[in-house]
Every structure is written in structure tokens, then in C-alpha cells.
């Protein structure tokens, strides 16, 4: 069987369909969840929906073979199989591997380290989100793009604040957290600022090493 991969965001409505036309005048068509759990079957001109976790949120289009699933959740991750029984008794099957991902949560930026080193300021920030498999990208005045959860940089003495943005993303969504840092290097926590909620399109968080229990929201 042919295998197609699909990645969608949780809570969305999904159409599972094949890119080719169905065999002409097929006898029966069945959608399975995994190898053998029937979801819906078309036979003798009518659709039969089976008792399953999909009942009430799926619909079959017998013309195209498309299966519509509403409000998909991560638990719907699976390989879906459409098997068609043709008039001559031969079968055709198509498989769709559905991956349902939650939108990434807003990242928390944590100050891991901040110290004076030879008149320069060594800064180590980490971008934290709870238990997700995501991609990280840091933006700001950096020698090169950093693509992991930790940013380490050494700042020359400067008068103006520097801002660093951590972008977390998966294949269905992305969110940013931005941290702005003002000299001197070991200044009080109040001098570290977050970009305002409006600029970021949502509330962001900063956690300093010294004060893990008090989040600063702006």
C-alpha cells in the first residue's frame, strides 16, 4: 500500500484522503484505525459507523473515499488504512500516518549564569518549554544563529540594552520569548526586561536563577 504522512495541529479538523481516484464501481470501502479497528464502512450504498472513539466525529465521503475527522487529539496519532474491495475481488489499500501535535507552549527564558569575565559580560540563557520535542532558534546580536535551547554569549561593555529572542517551533506552530538585558552585567533583576505582551503576541516569561519562584511578567 501507499503511505502518506500528515502532520496536523491538535483541535483541528482533518481530511484523510488519497491523491488518486478510487477504483470504479468498488464493492466495499473500509477505513481502519491501525491495522484492524474499523471506523466506517461503505457497502451496498450505505455507510456504517462503528463503535469506536471516532463515533460522532467522523464522516465518510463515498465518492472520493475521504474521511473527515473533527477535533483531532494527540491520542488520534496512528496509521489509518483505507481498504477498498474491487468488483473483481482484488483489494487496494492506502495508508495515512497521522501525527497530531499540540501547538508549542510559550517558552520560559531562564538566566542560568551571568558574570563579569575580564570586563566582558558572560551570559547563559536557557529557553524552556515543558516536555516537548521542538526546534529552538535564538535571534539577536549574535555571531551566528544558535539552534539549541541554551544561549551562551559574551558581551563587550555596552551602554544600550541587548535583546535575545528564543523561538520554539514544531511543524504546526511556533512561539517566541524575548529577553532584554541592560548593563551592568550583574545588575539587579529588575533591569532585565521582557518585551511587552503586545509586541510578542502573547505573555512571555523570564525566570532568573536567583528567583525561580517569582516569574516576572510584562
Amino acid at each position: 500500500g501507499r503511505l502518506v504522512h500528515m502532520t496536523v495541529v491538535s483541535g483541528s479538523n482533518v481530511t484523510l484522503n488519497i491523491s488518486e481516484s478510487l477504483p470504479e464501481n468498488y464493492k466495499q470501502l473500509t477505513w481502519f484505525y491501525t491495522f484492524d479497528q474499523k471506523i466506517v464502512e461503505w457497502d451496498s450504498g450505505k455507510s456504517k459507523y462503528f463503535e469506536s472513539k471516532f463515533k460522532g466525529r467522523v464522516r465518510l465521503d463515498p465518492q472520493s473515499g475521504a474521511l473527515y475527522i473533527s477535533k483531532v487529539q494527540k491520542e488520534d496519532n496512528s496509521t489509518y488504512v483505507m481498504r477498498v474491495l474491487k468488483k473483481d475481488g482484488y483489494e487496494q489499500e492506502w495508508k495515512i500516518k497521522l501525527q497530531v501535535l499540540d501547538p508549542v507552549p510559550k517558552p520560559v527564558i531562564k538566566i542560568e549564569k551571568r558574570e563579569d569575565v575580564d570586563d566582558n559580560c558572560y551570559l547563559k540563557l536557557s529557553c524552556v518549554i515543558p516536555g516537548e520535542s521542538v526546534n529552538y532558534t535564538w535571534y539577536g546580536e549574535l555571531p551566528k544563529e544558535i539552534q539549541n535551547s541554551v544561549l551562551e554569549t559574551t558581551l563587550k561593555p555596552h551602554k544600550h540594552s541587548r535583546c535575545y529572542t528564543c523561538q520554539v517551533s514544531n511543524s504546526v506552530s511556533s512561539k517566541n520569548g524575548t529577553f532584554c538585558f541592560s548593563p551592568p552585567c550583574t545588575a539587579a533583576r529588575s533591569e532585565q526586561k521582557l518585551i511587552s505582551e503586545e509586541d510578542l503576541g502573547g505573555e512571555q516569561k523570564l525566570i532568573s536563577e536567583e528567583d525561580l519562584h517569582h516569574h516576572h511578567h510584562h
Epitope: 500500500g1 464493492k27 491495522f35 475481488g89 483489494e91 489499500e93
Partner: antibody, heavy 117, light 107 residues
């Protein structure tokens, strides 16, 4: 033309295991299923399980769960069925059948397995 | 598991006779039913799939009908080569289950 070619007769002692092979020769299918069905002397047909060598999916009848295993060698288009902890009641002809999910349009000639002390 | 019950368990008929075998499923199986013929010492052979579709190469004197729970295999004019045991099998669900078989003998 497509054939399912099975391994030869086996004689086993109670408690032993048997491994029967089934080779799909002449097939050009990208996707096919192999079922195993057995028939005790003078008895009817009993379905044991199904495997899809292409994606590794298997499903066994509850009765055999825990002592049956279906494996495959895709390079030689051969499927294997191993049954362990043999009892005299396992004396039967073991058929592989396929190549469809629903119906068995093709059958091997059967492998007689005798379990006797 | 779905139980499949065949009747009669055996039938003896003459060449040219019409022979009917019935198969009842313990629950609705739509038209997911197959009929097989088995001759002594041989593997079964698919006759009918999807309750009423004739497998390629099978003589047209064999026909199948029914849906839901009640199914019939009919041999319209029995031929000498039609002796053997006939099995129905549901393919709606796992485990696939067979009827106990109907032995057809020629008078």
C-alpha cells in the same frame, strides 16, 4: 504465476516448537497478507493469525496468543510461523493462505505437523 | 468471537441436482463472507467472496447470496467434481472464523 510454497512435514515431541515456512514465489505485489490456518485430522479449518510482511503488522487468534510468532524475511518473500509448547492437540496440517486482507484466494499445499512422544 | 453455523453438516445428492448450503453468523457481518471448497488431502479453494461475488475461474453453477447474518451457497446443477467439504468464513472481524463444514457426496 503466484504460488505459496510451504516447508515439509514435521514430527515433534510435546513441549517442543515447530517453525513452518511459506514462500510467496512469482508475486509482484507491493503489499500482501499471509494468514495461517490449521486443520486437525478429520476436523474443520481454524484461523491462527495474519501478518503483513511489508509493515510488520500481525494479529493472532486469542487461543494461540503467547505461543505463536509470525516473522518474515522480505528479501526472500518468506513468512515463518512458529508455534511453541506443542501438545498432541496441535497435530494438524498447517496452511499459509493469502494474499488478501479479507479473503484467501491463494493457499499453500499445507505442512503436516505431528506431535507425539 | 463471531460463531459461524453451517447446515446441513452433510448432503448426498445426484448429478444435476440443485444443492443449497446455509451459513448463519452470530452477529451482523454485512456481506463479509467467503465460501471455500476443500477436497480430501488438498488445500481449500476460494469459490465466493463478499457473499455473492464469484472468484475468477470458478464455474457459474456456484452462486452465493445473503447479507447480515444469513447466507446461502447454491450449486445449481451438481457435477461429479463438486464432491468435497464446503466451508463458509466470516471476514468481517478478527479472529476470522469458519463454519464447521458441509460434506457434499454424490449419489
Amino acid at each position: 504465476q503466484v504460488q505459496l510454497v510451504q516447508s515439509g512435514a514435521e514430527v515433534k515431541k510435546p513441549g517442543a516448537s515447530v517453525k513452518v515456512s511459506c514462500k510467496a514465489s512469482g508475486h509482484t505485489f507491493t503489499n500482501y497478507y499471509i494468514h495461517w490456518v490449521r486443520q486437525a485430522p478429520g476436523q474443520g479449518l481454524e484461523w491462527m493469525g495474519i501478518t503483513n510482511p511489508n509493515d510488520g503488522n500481525t494479529r493472532y487468534a486469542q487461543k494461540f496468543q503467547g505461543r505463536i510468532s509470525m516473522t518474515w524475511d522480505t528479501s526472500t518473500s518468506t513468512v515463518f510461523m512458529e508455534l511453541s509448547s506443542l501438545k498432541s492437540e496441535d497435530t494438524a496440517v498447517y496452511y499459509c493462505a493469502g494474499l488478501r486482507y479479507w479473503f484467501f484466494d491463494l493457499w499453500g499445499r499445507g505442512t503436516p505437523v505431528t506431535v507425539s512422544s | 468471537d463471531i460463531q459461524m453455523t453451517q447446515s446441513p453438516s452433510s448432503v448426498s445428492a445426484s448429478v444435476g441436482d440443485r444443492v443449497t448450503i446455509t451459513c448463519r453468523a452470530s452477529q451482523d457481518i454485512s456481506s463479509w463472507l467467503a465460501w471455500y471448497q476443500q477436497k480430501p488431502g488438498k488445500a481449500p479453494n476460494l469459490l465466493i467472496f463478499a457473499a455473492s461475488s464469484l472468484q475468477s475461474g470458478v464455474p457459474s453453477r456456484f452462486s452465493g447470496s445473503g447479507s447480515g447474518t444469513d447466507f446461502t451457497l447454491t450449486i445449481s446443477s451438481l457435477q461429479p467434481e463438486d464432491f468435497g467439504t464446503y466451508y463458509c468464513q466470516q471476514t468481517d472481524n478478527f479472529p476470522r472464523t469458519f463454519g464447521q463444514g458441509t460434506k457434499v457426496e454424490i449419489n
